[in-house]
Every structure is written in structure tokens, then in C-alpha cells.
């Protein structure tokens, strides 16, 4: 479906040696930065979750077709504070609407090398990938 | 180690063997209900993003040792309705706390068998995971 | 080397509440999770719940669900728990074990590696 | 929930003996098993993780077998040390369940 040619790439390859463990986040393709439009920041009665929020967001495609899940979906806050449960618009400098990240299991294909160090298929090393998922409204962090 | 002999069989095996793909969600263990307490339906000052959130939320744990990854969380609204940007505390009706879902994609270790039908180590299935992600506050839907 | 010391022992009243602390050394403390386990006087063990420290994931037994509240402060690497409305049955000594992950990636193991000294809670009126 | 149930309760031997105690899990649990020691103190420790690889510094007197829902735990040599409570648990499935506990004696 994918076309890797085959995952593992002969009997007897320890499943190790298929899913190698790295700790260390792979940032995703563009930073984060907040991307505030006036022009959208409200909350809308109807429509998806991120559009009817307070702290509304849209998603940013980010895909890789070596990397299993390919495509990944950053958020992107459209207001730096939460928008007014009453009006839907005005926007209320006592919230602030900040992303919420997640480290996310992802897997990328990688060659690999028979006992001679011939190519011999891909393998799937698993990695933390960091991923924005919503943005959220919260009070402001008072600093002790 | 965890005696799993190969994960793919033999050599050329299709990688869509190893990683079949579903698009059937497969269920949370546990309903992703609300799960309100008033002690704790609150918005802190400090703390981390999920306490601060005006529509906070607890994790809970769902462990499968044969998924990759093996720990996921689901968010539990600890409130029916946002806490008052003013407050901290006070339910303001006019919002209500949303979860958020992700049809995540997970990996479940499976038998492989080869072409005779012997067992032949173990392959990974892909498949699409519905998880809570977050609470949300957001504004109420307004039928048409 | 990994330690975990708790606090003293609590005597407490029926209806009452208990807090139980574990102090974590020797290790990364948001790197494992903490179970909490329980033993009643002359029975065996009985597991209540855990806490993952770095994102204050839980998973609690059914049977103490509404009644548990499994927290930590990272800032001190201490994790608590904390039994409401106390029975006379829930006296019982109360253990603290963090959880190993062992073998390759990427299916872990999962073991008490080290646990507490106890903590006796005894409710009585 | 998954039942452990722990045999037997208790057992009395002599220093030397090689002791066996099982444990039947109330379905497959896949070798998701674990072994801990209670010394009379309260002191508890871990034994054998995963049926049967030895946790760190543990004599390789203790080992462990099994598959499917049927486990045992085996000192092949008693030694006076040994004196304590033996607890199975699983880790197949939350919660996690411990079988009732085999009490040890010293002839």
C-alpha cells in the first residue's frame, strides 16, 4: 500500500533491530509560532470543536511519507487570549488561549543492513514526535 | 526477549502484510465519560496546562502491552461547564467543558503466518485508536 | 541508590481522610510510575492504583474510585495518596512501589521494583 | 478483573529443601507474571519479573516457569533467609491483581 518493499528484511531479524527506541523528540517541520487572525478569532456557535472553542485553533498538514502516521496535524491558536463566553468575539485579557503538546509515538523507515552490510529492506524505528493537538484557555500562571 | 522470533517472517515479505490498515476505530477500554468532581472542578493558577485549562481535565491511564505505544491517555472533564475566568472556581453555564477526540494510530503485535500457515514470529497490525485527547471550553452548539 | 520513605503512621476516625506521602530518591522521578498498594492486617496485597508522575496519568481500581486521589509534586519528587471517608476496613498498612520498565523496546516489562516501608493507617472511633 | 489464585496458603520445610509454590491466574495473562518476597518485617521485594527472569541481586536460587494461566515458583535450596511471604501478580491486564500469598516456614 505504502510500497516499502518490505519491513523486515529477513527471517530471524530481531524485532529490536525493527523498532529501535530513540528518546529524543524529533521537532516537527515548522515551529509552533501562534498565528493569531483577527478575522477568525471567534468562537462560533456551530461547527467543529476547534472553531466553537474559546481559544479557537485550525490545523497545519505535516506530512512525511517516510514516517508512519504520513500525515500529522499541528494546531495553531488564532488568539492569544480566550474569546468572551458571552459575546463570541471580544476577547478576555484574564484568559489565555495556549497549545497543548503532546510527545506522539511515530515511526520512520529507515534501510536496513544485512550481517555483510548489504541493503536488505526497511525497518521502522520508533521516535517522539512533538505535536500541538488544540489550544486551550486557561487562567494565567501566577508566579509564586 | 520477549520471545517474539522475527517480527516479519521472511525476506519480501509485503510491508502491507506486516502493517494491515484498518480504518475501523478500535473503542476505548472504558467509555470516555464525564467524570465530574466538584472538589477538583476548578482552574488552578499554577500547575500544569490540564489543571490551569478553565475546563480542566484528569488523565487516565489505558495500558495494552501488545499495542504500540503500549501506555495511552484519556482526558476525563472534571467539570459539565467552564470555571469562571474571574474566579478560578464558579461554573459559568454560558460554556461548556468538550472532550476533544483523536482517532489515533496505534500498532497491535499479531501472529504472523507464513505460506504454509506455520506460525512465523509476529507482525504488526495498523489500526486507528479513538482517544480523548483534551477538555474544551466551548461555546454551545445553536441548532438551526 | 532508589529509596522510597513515606510518612508515619495515622490514626484516623471513621468519615475522616488520609494522606499518605512517598519521598523518591536515587532516580528520575518523572521517569517512573508509582503504584500504590495496600495490606490489611493478616491478608495479602491489594493494588489501589498508580500515578504517572510526569503528566499525573492515573488508573485507579474500581473498587476505590471516587474515594482515591493519587497525586505528586514534581518539585520534591514526592507522590501521595489520599483515602476519603475512611471505613474501619480500610485499616491496613499502605505501601508505595514504583514501577520498572524492563527488556528491549518497544514492548516493555512492567514490575515493583522498589518499594516503601509502609505506612500503618488505622481507623477507629 | 483477573483472579490469581495462589497455592498453597502456607508450607513448612527444611533448610536444603526445594520449595515449589504455583499460581493459576483466572485466564491467559501470557507469561505477564511477577514474584515478590514479604519478610516478616513488612520489607517487600522484588523477585522474578516476566515468569522468570531474575530481578538484580536476586540469588539464582529462586526461579520461575509457566505459560498460559499456570505459573510456578521454585527455591531449589531453602536457606533460613527464605523465611517470608511469597505474592504472584499479574501485570496482563489493570488492575493488577497479587494472588493471596504463600507463608513460608522453617521446620
Known amino acids: 500500500y505504502s510500497h516499502w518493499p518490505s519491513c523486515c528484511p529477513s527471517k530471524g531479524y530481531p524485532s529490536e533491530e525493527l523498532l529501535r527506541w530513540s528518546t529524543v523528540p524529533v521537532p516537527p517541520l515548522k515551529p509552533a509560532s501562534l498565528d493569531f487572525h483577527s478575522v477568525s478569532c471567534r468562537a462560533s456557535e456551530d461547527g467543529p470543536l476547534n472553531s466553537r472553542a474559546i481559544s479557537p485553533w485550525r490545523y497545519e498538514l505535516d506530512r512525511d511519507l517516510n514516517r508512519l502516521p504520513q500525515d500529522l496535524y499541528h494546531a495553531r491558536c488564532l488568539c492569544p487570549h480566550c474569546v468572551s463566553l458571552q459575546t463570541g468575539s471580544h476577547m478576555d485579557p484574564r484568559g489565555n488561549s495556549e497549545l497543548l503538546y503532546h510527545n506522539q509515538t511515530v515511526f520512520y523507515r529507515r534501510p536496513c543492513h544485512g550481517k555483510k552490510g548489504n541493503h536488505k529492506g526497511y525497518c521502522l524505528e520508533r521516535r517522539l514526535y512533538r505535536v500541538s493537538l488544540a489550544c486551550v484557555c486557561v487562567r494565567p500562571r501566577v508566579m509564586g | 526477549y520477549s520471545h517474539w522470533p522475527s517480527c516479519c517472517p521472511s525476506k519480501g515479505y509485503p510491508s502491507e502484510e506486516l502493517l494491515r490498515w484498518s480504518t475501523v476505530p478500535v473503542p476505548p477500554l472504558k467509555p470516555a465519560s464525564l467524570d465530574f468532581h466538584s472538589v477538583s472542578c476548578r482552574a488552578s493558577e499554577d500547575g500544569p496546562l490540564n489543571s490551569r485549562a478553565i475546563s480542566p481535565w484528569r488523565y487516565e491511564l489505558d495500558r495494552d502491552l501488545n499495542r504500540l505505544p503500549q501506555d495511552l491517555y484519556h482526558a476525563r472533564c472534571l467539570c459539565p461547564h467552564c470555571v469562571s475566568l474571574q474566579t478560578g472556581s464558579h461554573m459559568d453555564p454560558r460554556g461548556n467543558s468538550e472532550l476533544l477526540y483523536h482517532n489515533q494510530t496505534v500498532f497491535y503485535r499479531r501472529p504472523c503466518h507464513g505460506k504454509k500457515g506455520n506460525h512465523k514470529g509476529y507482525c504488526l497490525e495498523r489500526r486507528l485508536y479513538r482517544v480523548s485527547l483534551a477538555c474544551v471550553c466551548v461555546r454551545p452548539r445553536v441548532m438551526g | 541508590q532508589v529509596q522510597l520513605v513515606q510518612s508515619g503512621a495515622e490514626v484516623k476516625k471513621p468519615g475522616a481522610s488520609v494522606k499518605v506521602s512517598c519521598k523518591a530518591s536515587?532516580?528520575?522521578?518523572?521517569?517512573?510510575?508509582m503504584n500504590w498498594v495496600r495490606q490489611a492486617p493478616g491478608q495479602g496485597l491489594e493494588w489501589m492504583g498508580l500515578?504517572?508522575?510526569?503528566?499525573?496519568?492515573?488508573s485507579y481500581k474500581q473498587k476505590f474510585q471516587g474515594r482515591v486521589t493519587m497525586t505528586v509534586d514534581k518539585s520534591i519528587s514526592t507522590a501521595y495518596m489520599e483515602l476519603s471517608r475512611l471505613r474501619s476496613d480500610d485499616t491496613a498498612v499502605y505501601y508505595c512501589?514504583?514501577?520498572?520498565?524492563?527488556?528491549?523496546?518497544?514492548?516493555?516489562?512492567?514490575?515493583?521494583?522498589?518499594w516503601g516501608q509502609g505506612t500503618l493507617v488505622t481507623v477507629s472511633s | 478483573d483477573i483472579q490469581m489464585t495462589q497455592s498453597p496458603s502456607s508450607l513448612s520445610a527444611s533448610v536444603g529443601d526445594r520449595v515449589t509454590i504455583t499460581c493459576q491466574a483466572s485466564?491467559?495473562?501470557?507469561?505477564?507474571l511477577n514474584w515478590y518476597q514479604q519478610k516478616p518485617d513488612g520489607t517487600i521485594k522484588l523477585l522474578i519479573y516476566?515468569?522468570?527472569t531474575l530481578h538484580t541481586g536476586v540469588p539464582s536460587r529462586f526461579s520461575g516457569s509457566g505459560s498460559g494461566t499456570d505459573y510456578t515458583f521454585t527455591i531449589s535450596s531453602l536457606q533460613p533467609e527464605d523465611i517470608a511471604t511469597y505474592y504472584c501478580?499479574?501485570?496482563?491486564?489493570?488492575?493488577?491483581?497479587f494472588g493471596q500469598g504463600t507463608k513460608l516456614e522453617i521446620k
Open positions: 512501589a514504583r514501577e520498572g520498565y524492563y527488556g528491549p523496546s518497544p514492548f516493555h516489562h512492567y514490575a515493583m521494583d522498589y
Open positions: 536515587g532516580y528520575s522521578f518523572t521517569g517512573y510510575t
Open positions: 500515578i504517572n508522575p510526569d503528566n499525573g496519568g492515573t
Open positions: 485466564q491467559d495473562i501470557s507469561n505477564y
Open positions: 516476566y515468569t522468570s
Open positions: 501478580q499479574q501485570y496482563s491486564k489493570l488492575p493488577y491483581t
